[in-house]
């Protein structure tokens, strides 16, 4: 006569997080008397998942009616699977006794849990940088399983190649995290640009997750200054303008100096926006020529976004 066999037909089972996992197990005989128990893992540290004889296992239900007279199906369903449930599950037949003794084990079923990655979070540098500088962006996503994942970087739809990616941990784990750093060279036209981190994973059914960063939060475009003298408005007055062009962000303070002495300070308010997202602003100064005996040096000094001031001067000729 053949001795009882414990049959676990599935070597592996893969389940999405949140779903139920069905682990199949049948025995070939009702002999000997004694319960079936399910364990996760093997050896002394194995974890009891279900005991036919006793105990309360709220997440576990038997697929067949375990009290049915000729039941030889001891498959179980585990509800609300999380990555922490991953492992190898063994269906084990025990022989009635005091205590029950292990009689025969199934070969085991490896349960792998498919868990979606979290939405990628993209973060840029703490301080703004100017065009032609290289800045680093990081992208992080967590809690996914299995480990295989693809991450891509884009700037305005163009794929970037200068990045480094790590998936942690390196060894076996219930879930994984990805961390990537991309290098981006800024240009003056990047105010409206976006950097996108795209994560593709088996759980996403071909619909990757994206995280974005707006370069408007990273870039600083310093202004160009041009000081010009306008035609004489009145006999003793000259109108001098300071054109502040192509700057970003808007935070800007302008100071007029006459021969090195502060004449007026103002903050950029009514600016015009260029197509590329930068701003233009113009300030003018009415100079009373009759108040000056000598030539006047007019300086337009601009402090942009807390940076050291830049200036442009204009010499105003005073005719005797």
């Amino acid at each position: 006569e053949e001795e009882l066999q414990v049959i676990q037909p599935d070597k592996s089972v893969s389940v999405a997080a949140g779903e139920s996992a069905i682990l199949h197990c049948t025995v070939t005989s009702l002999i000997p008397v004694g319960p079936i128990q399910w364990f996760r893992g093997a050896g002394p540290a194995r974890e009891l998942i279900y005991n036919q004889k006793e105990g309360h296992f709220p997440r576990v239900t038997t697929v067949s009616e375990s009290t049915k007279r000729e039941n030889m199906d001891f498959s179980i369903s585990i509800s609300n699977i999380t990555p922490a449930d991953a492992g190898t599950y063994y269906c084990v037949k025990f022989r009635k006794g005091s205590p029950d003794t292990e009689f025969k084990s199934g070969a085991g079923t490896e349960l792998s849990v498919r868990a979606k990655p979290s939405a990628p979070v993209v973060s840029g540098p703490a301080a703004r940088a100017t065009p032609q500088h290289t800045v680093s962006f990081t992208c992080e996503s967590h809690g996914f399983s299995p480990r295989d994942i693809t991450l891509k970087w884009f700037k305005n739809g163009n794929e970037l190649s200068d990045f480094q990616t790590n998936v942690d941990p390196v060894g076996e784990s219930v879930s994984y995290s990805i961390h990537s750093t991309a290098k981006v060279v800024l240009t003056r036209e990047d105010v409206h640009s976006q950097v996108i981190c795209e994560v593709a994973h088996v759980t996403l059914q071909g619909d990757p997750l994206r995280g974005t960063a707006n370069l408007s939060e990273t870039i600083r475009v310093p202004p160009t200054l041009e000081v010009t003298q306008q035609p004489v408005r009145a006999e003793n007055q000259v109108n001098v303008t300071c054109q502040v062009r192509k700057f970003y962000p808007q935070r800007l303070q302008l100071t007029w100096l006459e021969n090195g002495n502060v004449s007026r300070t103002e903050t950029a308010s009514t600016v015009t926006e260029n197509k590329d997202g930068t701003y233009n602003w113009m300030s003018w100064l009415l100079v009373n020529v009759s108040a000056h005996r000598d030539d006047v040096k007019l300086t337009c000094q601009v402090e942009h976004d807390g940076q050291p001031a830049v200036s442009k001067s204009h010499d105003l000729k005073v005719s005797a």
Epitope: E3, L4, I31, P32, V33, E54, R69, K96, G97
Partner: antibody, heavy 115, light 111 residues
Framework: RQLVESGGGLVQPGGSLRLSCAAS????????ISWVRQAPGKGLEWVGT?????ITYYASWAKGRFTGSKTSSTAYLQMTSLRAEDTAVYYC????????????WGQGTLVTVSS | DIEMTQSPSSVSASVGDRVTLTCQAS????????LAWYQQKPGQAPKLLIY???TLATGVPSRFSGSGSGTDFTLTISSLQPEDFATYYC???????????FGGGTKVEIK
């Protein structure tokens, strides 16, 4: 599905007897067969259960004198050193107890131990 | 070894009566539920009614029910029928494979 016993009869004290239990409609391969006896006018008494190979077990009073065995279609109970108090109707039943209760029973065979 | 005590040893009842039979084990049965009930009529083999303390066997009328756990068990016949007059035995299993013991039986007689 049924079980049919045979082999009962009159035997002298100290004698031996082998009872048979033939199954029809199902195989005994995956089931235990238990033997239960009932002395005249008395209650039921579990004798032992025959599983597979080494998996056989008996009531403490039956150990050493009673031995069970089975094939896929027939179970046997070999009884030795019989005594007057072994006189009873012997039933075979399919099952091993707990979640494998005795659900099919034979009609019983009478064993009389007397000189 | 486990010992099983049934009470009463006999009970007289009428058709339609609710009848309750009890079975007490000297120690907790295996798994707290290794308890079966059998019905036997004169000249016949026993018949399985209930197993695992409360599971109704196939083909058994629903007027039979079992309850209990550990050491104390009950067989209830909700409305006694003429064919229910018989002797009822409980079979309890201890923690050892070779520890299966029948109670002494309760005879249900016509009043």
């Amino acid at each position: 599905r049924q079980l049919v016993e045979s082999g009962g009869g009159l035997v002298q004290p100290g004698g031996s007897l082998r009872l048979s239990c033939a199954a029809s409609g199902f195989s005994l391969s995956s089931h235990g067969i238990s033997w239960v006896r009932q002395a005249p006018g008395k209650g039921l008494e579990w004798v032992g259960t025959i599983g597979t190979g080494v998996i056989t077990y008996y009531a403490s009073w039956a150990k050493g004198r009673f031995t069970g065995s089975k094939t896929s279609s027939t179970a046997y109970l070999q009884m030795t050193s019989l005594r007057a108090e072994d006189t009873a109707v012997y039933y075979c039943a399919r099952g091993s107890a707990w979640n494998d209760p005795f659900d099919y029973w034979g009609q019983g065979t009478l064993v009389t131990v007397s000189s | 070894d486990i010992e099983m005590t049934q009470s009463p040893s006999s009970v007289s009842a009428s058709v339609g009566d609710r009848v309750t039979l009890t079975c007490q084990a000297s120690q907790s049965v295996y798994g707290n539920n290794d308890l079966a009930w059998y019905q036997q009529k004169p000249g016949q083999a026993p018949k399985l009614l209930i197993y695992l303390a409360s599971t109704l066997a196939t083909g058994v009328p629903s007027r039979f029910s079992g309850s209990g756990s550990g050491t104390d068990f009950t067989l209830t016949i909700s409305s006694l029928q003429p064919e229910d007059f018989a002797t009822y035995y409980c079979l309890g299993g201890g923690d050892d494979e070779a520890d299966n013991v029948f109670g002494g039986g309760t005879k249900v007689e016509i009043k």
